[in-house]
């Protein structure tokens, strides 16, 4: 009888350990990716940024994948997504082609099943960066809560990529899972 | 036998209560600190802001410590950190020393073990606040997901602190723990 | 005896299932509301935005209620609140009444019990949108961690509502519950 009770208890322990593992101990996905400025496009138009660090300095990733410039969702869920994009110009970098700039970021979601891209969040500003000042700076922050499915991809598009601040504290984006889909 | 079964059940209950306490019911750390404007430094250079409220109005703290102007981590984990910093100037406050301003925020992490400070996030803008307008305003928001260890300290640095908006809804920073470190 | 043991086990299972449901499986409240631009007030003064989508595109809501232009809390807790507000103007829309603008957002909390409204977060900028440029754009992002009680209401106020960008990726606000109140 005592042996049977212990078996019952083990079942209880085991099933609950499974539940606990799934509900809490199973690592919730996250990513914080910082700009890799060694390969920034040259144009002033809107471009997708494909070079990001995922494993140095503040950059990190867990239970998500970074591939071909995109953050890939491995686990269905509701995620908080965010991006911080800094632009800067110093007169030593040369003369700007135009002093009227559109400094923008677009956080996009792509579904492989339905090969289409949709903008989840956008932010930015038009700026007049006159030659009267030797230094100019501007940062954008966006964030929001989105349902993401396994296999979906998050990417970042910006205008005027050659003006990006290459510091890891300046230009980054990320995500963390907040809860499951019901 | 029945007594033995109850003891077994109590063990199951007890161990799971411990697990539940650790995994869910143990309060997850957080803080939302609002500016204490009674002690804002003057000058236009970059300074660390040391005066924040932690227990009035919207300000609150739990399982973190506020000491010497720094938010101290008591529990290892991955945290979402954020800051909202508002700058403003009204002509009744007097003439600005310069109309070309760098309005910036830096969210920094200091480790006591290795006495060094690192910037986790930065944001802001250069602004031209001309005398043609009687009122000027600008806000910065930054946020990101970071691994923090017990004993590490988070602090806020800004440029032009004398231009800070002293309202609790304007100038604040905070953190909340999202998940454990694996 | 064996039947009694099973009953004990069922009690253990049942109580833990309750705990698990409450602690994890009970859906944590959230909302992501996107601007409904069919009913945006005119004028340049501060107005409350009452028209938001909650069930189309990126907009969604769970365990919270949207009513009369306000996001109503149904479950006590600590929530992360956020808003992203975009303003834009193209010369084809006509001349601005003034080139000096205050583009602001206020995230407010109203308690029905104590009929008063308080600003939780604010952000924005004064802007000079001159006629030299055919297009102007500016975005604001704010976010913070707040204790909300069941029945409290969150609303969004902005200045210059007629300049709002009506895209769902541009102008939105939201909330998600992070943890219980101790």
């Amino acid at each position: 009888g005592s042996q049977h009770i212990r078996a019952e208890k083990a079942m209880v322990d085991g099933s609950w350990l499974d539940l606990a593992k799934r509900s809490k101990l199973e690592a919730q996905p996250f990513a914080h990716l910082t700009i890799n400025a060694t390969d920034i496009p040259s144009g002033s138009h809107k471009v997708s940024l494909s070079s990001w660090y995922h494993d140095r300095g503040w950059a990190k990733i867990s239970n998500m994948t970074f591939s071909n410039g995109k953050l890939i969702v491995n686990q269905d869920g509701f995620y908080y997504l965010y991006a911080n994009i800094c632009f800067r110009h110093h007169e030593t970098s040369g003369d700007l082609a135009t002093e009227y700039l559109q400094l923008m970021v677009y956080v996009t979601k792509t579904s492989i099943k339905i090969p289409s891209s949709h903008t989840l969040m956008k932010g930015g500003s038009t700026k007049y960066w006159s030659g009267n000042s030797e230094f100019h700076f501007y940062s954008i922050n966006v964030g929001g809560f989105f349902k993401l499915r396994s296999g979906e991809e998050i990417s970042i598009e910006v205008s005027n990529p050659s003006l990006l601040d290459p510091d890891q504290d300046a230009t980054y984006f990320g995500a963390f899972k907040v809860r499951d889909i019901d | 036998g029945s007594q033995h079964i109850r003891a077994e059940k109590a063990m199951v209950d007890g161990s799971w209560l411990d697990l539940a306490k650790r995994s869910k019911l143990e309060a997850q750390p957080f803080a939302h600190l609002t500016i204490n404007a009674t002690d804002i430094p003057s000058g236009s250079h970059k300074v660390s802001l040391s005066s924040w409220y932690h227990d009035r109005g919207w300000a609150k703290i739990s399982n973190m410590t506020f000491s010497n102007g720094k938010l101290i981590v008591n529990q290892d984990g991955f945290y979402y950190l954020y800051a909202n910093i508002c700058f403003r100037h009204h002509e009744t406050s007097g003439d600005l020393a310069t109309e070309y301003l760098q309005l910036m925020v830096y969210v920094t992490k200091t480790s006591i073990k290795i006495p060094s400070s690192h910037t986790l996030m930065k944001g802001g803008s250069t602004k031209y606040w001309s005398g043609n307008s009687e009122f000027h305003f600008y806000s910065i928001n930054v946020g990101g997901f970071f691994k923090l260890r017990s004993g590490e300290e988070i602090s806020i640095e800004v440029s032009n602190p004398s231009l800070l908006d002293p309202d609790q809804d304007a100038t604040y920073f905070g953190a909340f723990k999202v998940r454990d470190i694996d | 005896g064996s039947q009694h043991i099973r009953a004990e086990k069922a009690m253990v299972d049942g109580s833990w299932l309750d705990l698990a449901k409450r602690s994890k499986l009970e859906a944590q409240p959230f909302a992501h509301l996107t601007i409904n631009a069919t009913d945006i007030p005119s004028g340049s003064h501060k107005v409350s935005l009452s028209s938001w989508y909650h069930d189309r595109g990126w907009a969604k809501i769970s365990n919270m209620t949207f009513s009369n232009g306000k996001l109503i809390v149904n479950q006590d807790g600590f929530y992360y609140l956020y808003a992203n507000i975009c303003f834009r103007h193209h010369e084809t829309s006509g001349d601005l009444a003034t080139e000096y603008l205050q583009l602001m957002v206020y995230v407010t909390k109203t308690s029905i019990k104590i009929p008063s409204s308080h600003t939780l977060m604010k952000g924005g900028s004064t802007k000079y949108w001159s006629g030299n440029s055919e297009f102007h754009f500016y975005s604001i992002n704010v976010g913070g961690f707040f204790k909300l009680r069941s029945g409290e209401e969150i609303s969004i106020e902005v200045s210059n509502p007629s300049l709002l960008d009506p895209d769902q990726d541009a102008t939105y606000f939201g909330a998600f519950k992070v943890r219980d109140i101790d």
Partner: antibody
Framework: QVQLVESGGGVVQPGRSLRLSCAAS????????MHWVRQAPDKGLEWVAV????????YYADSVKGRFTISRDNSKNTLYLQMNSLRAEDTAVYYC????????WGYGMDVWGQGTTVTVS | DIQMTQSPSTLSASVGDRVTITCRAS??????LAWYQQKPGKAPKLLIY???SLESGVPSRFSGSGSGTEFTLTISSLQPDDFATYYC?????????FGQGTKVEIK
Amino acid sequence: QVQLVESGGGVVQPGRSLRLSCAASGFTFSGYGMHWVRQAPDKGLEWVAVLSYDGTNKYYADSVKGRFTISRDNSKNTLYLQMNSLRAEDTAVYYCAKCLSGTYWGYGMDVWGQGTTVTVS
Amino acid sequence: DIQMTQSPSTLSASVGDRVTITCRASQSISSWLAWYQQKPGKAPKLLIYKASSLESGVPSRFSGSGSGTEFTLTISSLQPDDFATYYCQQYNSYSWTFGQGTKVEIK
């Protein structure tokens, strides 16, 4: 592939006008400044004019200022050079060229067309 | 306007030679200098920008150096495909000018 194709050249009498076009493909035309450069027979290269990616800023060599106008239509991926009051010394092969950097001046011209010949006589 | 003076005007060399072409600006242009190669009947081709940055796809035997008023283009080991005319081009304050060219011919 990235390509620029000039057209509109020909023989014209002094004092008359001509409009050159440059059709761009293979890159985001609206993201880059564009130049016109010319080369007289058996001579070196001479810069003529430049236009920023958004059309807001344009600059000209002294030799053509007031006579030539550079413009673009980003919807058609096309650059133009309107040449008025043409002179014999304007005889040359005219090249359009793309700025290497869209944001900054000064980085050089990384894509060139094959050129179109203008003869003023 | 800033004048650009290239030297020599003509250079005779053999395959495998190390070749250096100089370009002088009439006033400082910082590092805002580019080098181009042009073959008869063809459009110019960008080799070097910002004085020393090698354009994508250009062989590494080409290199640029200098700043201020004095700049050089070096071909470390001349190849048969390198016989052409080379131009420097400066940028300064919304004005662009080319040097008169250096013709590299077979000795």
